[in-house]
């Protein structure tokens, strides 16, 4: 399978909310024993390879923010401490897979990555993961709402095996 | 368009010291502003910025050393409690360049800085 | 925070000569890099931004490049007027807005 994300890039006013996307593509294998461990992390922008190191957002790891379930299957974080900090990451039955982040100031700009790991019980992990931008701008040349810019067809399946 | 800082002065260490920015021909409310400092014969020193929005962010080093607040036509930086370390110019910028409020075209409109003296 | 490495700290070049100064970003910050030029007794002034784009009234005698980390401001043909310090500075994120140490510039 790979990850495709749909958004290279996202613009928005500070204040504003925003949904960050990622897409599970090709085969997914719904096995009993195969689970799915989705999650979302910041990372610098690597010369080399994009989302190498993980950082928090808005101070929550990457773990604080996973979800973990079987193939195509919803689900969505419920912890209370990610509300707290303004997040939510969800996951649909179409591979769709997101992190909502509300009132933007300026420090949340930076590179996101989305990360998708498939484990097989009692045998090894397939690791996954997407890169996209988001500025968060100020002033009067910042858009009214969030502007996404569609990844190139070559970005948007931005396989990283690992 | 032009922004002017003023308030430099002598000041004991310790002494609080509020350092004031005054925008003319643009509107605060449209960009945000940023203060920088340069001690006698040394660099430019990131202090902070206050967006147009009126959020304030600081560099790591400066949090709880100074505070940025401002006006519809002004914008102050607050030195609580200075010491021999903090003499020196600072000065107010505008964030963008031109006239866009681009945050990652960097300081295009500055002011010709005020200078700030703690000694005892 | 993004540490900006700035070499050489000081330069002397004739006029007509050319100087390069390079500044080194502590990790990956895309193309969000302006450079300043300043003289004794006045604020600094934007030359370029976004690594390579000039800023209106700046001569093509200067110019900006970016090679992954590492960023570079030359200055052909040399004038007296160019004498100043340069300043690299990150526009990258708002709490590493951090500006190089600087680089003499010295015309003969």
């Known amino acids: 399978f790979k990850v495709a994300t749909p958004y290279s890039l996202y613009v928005c006013p500070e204040g504003q909310n925003v949904t960050l996307t990622c897409r599970l593509l090709g085969p997914v294998d719904k096995g009993h024993d195969v689970t799915f461990y989705k999650t979302w992390y910041r990372s610098s922008r690597g010369e080399v390879q994009t989302c190498s190191e993980r950082r928090p957002i808005r101070n929550l790891t990457f773990q604080d923010l996973h979800l973990h379930h079987g193939g195509h299957q919803a689900a969505n974080t419920s912890h209370d401490l990610a509300q707290r900090h303004g997040l939510e990451s969800a996951s649909d039955h179409h591979g769709n897979f997101s992190i909502t982040m509300r009132n933007l100031t300026l420090l949340d700009s930076g590179l996101y990555c989305c990360l998708v790991v498939e484990i097989r019980h009692h045998h090894s992990e397939h690791r996954v993961h997407g890169a996209m931008e988001l500025q968060v701008q100020t002033g009067k040349d910042a858009p009214s709402n969030c502007v996404v810019y569609p990844s190139s067809s070559q970005d948007s399946e931005n396989i990283t095996a690992a | 368009q032009s922004v002017e800082e003023s308030g430099g002065r002598l000041v004991t260490p310790g002494t609080p010291l509020t350092l004031t920015c005054t925008a003319s021909?643009?509107?605060?409310?449209?960009?945000?502003m940023t203060w920088v400092r340069q001690a006698p014969g040394k660099g430019l020193e990131y202090i902070g910025i206050?967006?147009?929005?009126?959020y304030t962010y600081y560099a790591s080093w400066a949090t709880g050393r100074f505070t940025i607040s401002k006006t519809s036509t002004t914008v102050d930086l607050k030195i609580p409690s200075p010491t021999a370390e903090d003499a020196a110019t600072y000065f107010c910028?505008?964030?963008?360049?031109?006239?866009?409020?681009?945050?990652?075209?960097?300081?295009?409109?500055w002011g010709p800085g005020t200078l700030a003296t703690v000694s005892s | 925070d993004v540490v900006m490495t700035q070499t050489p700290a000081s330069v002397s070049e004739p006029v007509g000569g050319t100087v390069t100064i390079k500044c080194q970003a502590s990790?990956?910050?895309?193309?969000?890099l302006a450079w300043y030029q300043q003289k004794p007794g006045q604020p600094p002034k934007l030359l370029i931004y976004?690594?390579?784009t000039l800023a209106s009234g700046v001569p093509s005698r200067f110019e900006g490049s970016r090679s992954g980390t590492e960023f570079t401001l030359t200055i052909s043909d040399l004038e007296c007027a160019d004498a100043a310090t340069y300043y690299c500075?990150?526009?990258?994120?708002?709490?590493?807005?951090?500006f190089g140490g600087g680089t003499e510039v010295v015309v003969k």
């Open positions: 976004l690594a390579s």
């Open positions: 500075h990150c526009t990258d994120s708002i709490i590493n807005y951090n």
């Open positions: 021909g643009f509107s605060l409310s449209d960009y945000a």
């Open positions: 990790e990956s910050i895309s193309n969000y």
């Open positions: 206050i967006s147009a929005g009126g």
């Open positions: 910028a505008r964030v963008g360049y031109a006239d866009s409020s681009d945050i990652y075209k960097g300081f295009y409109l």
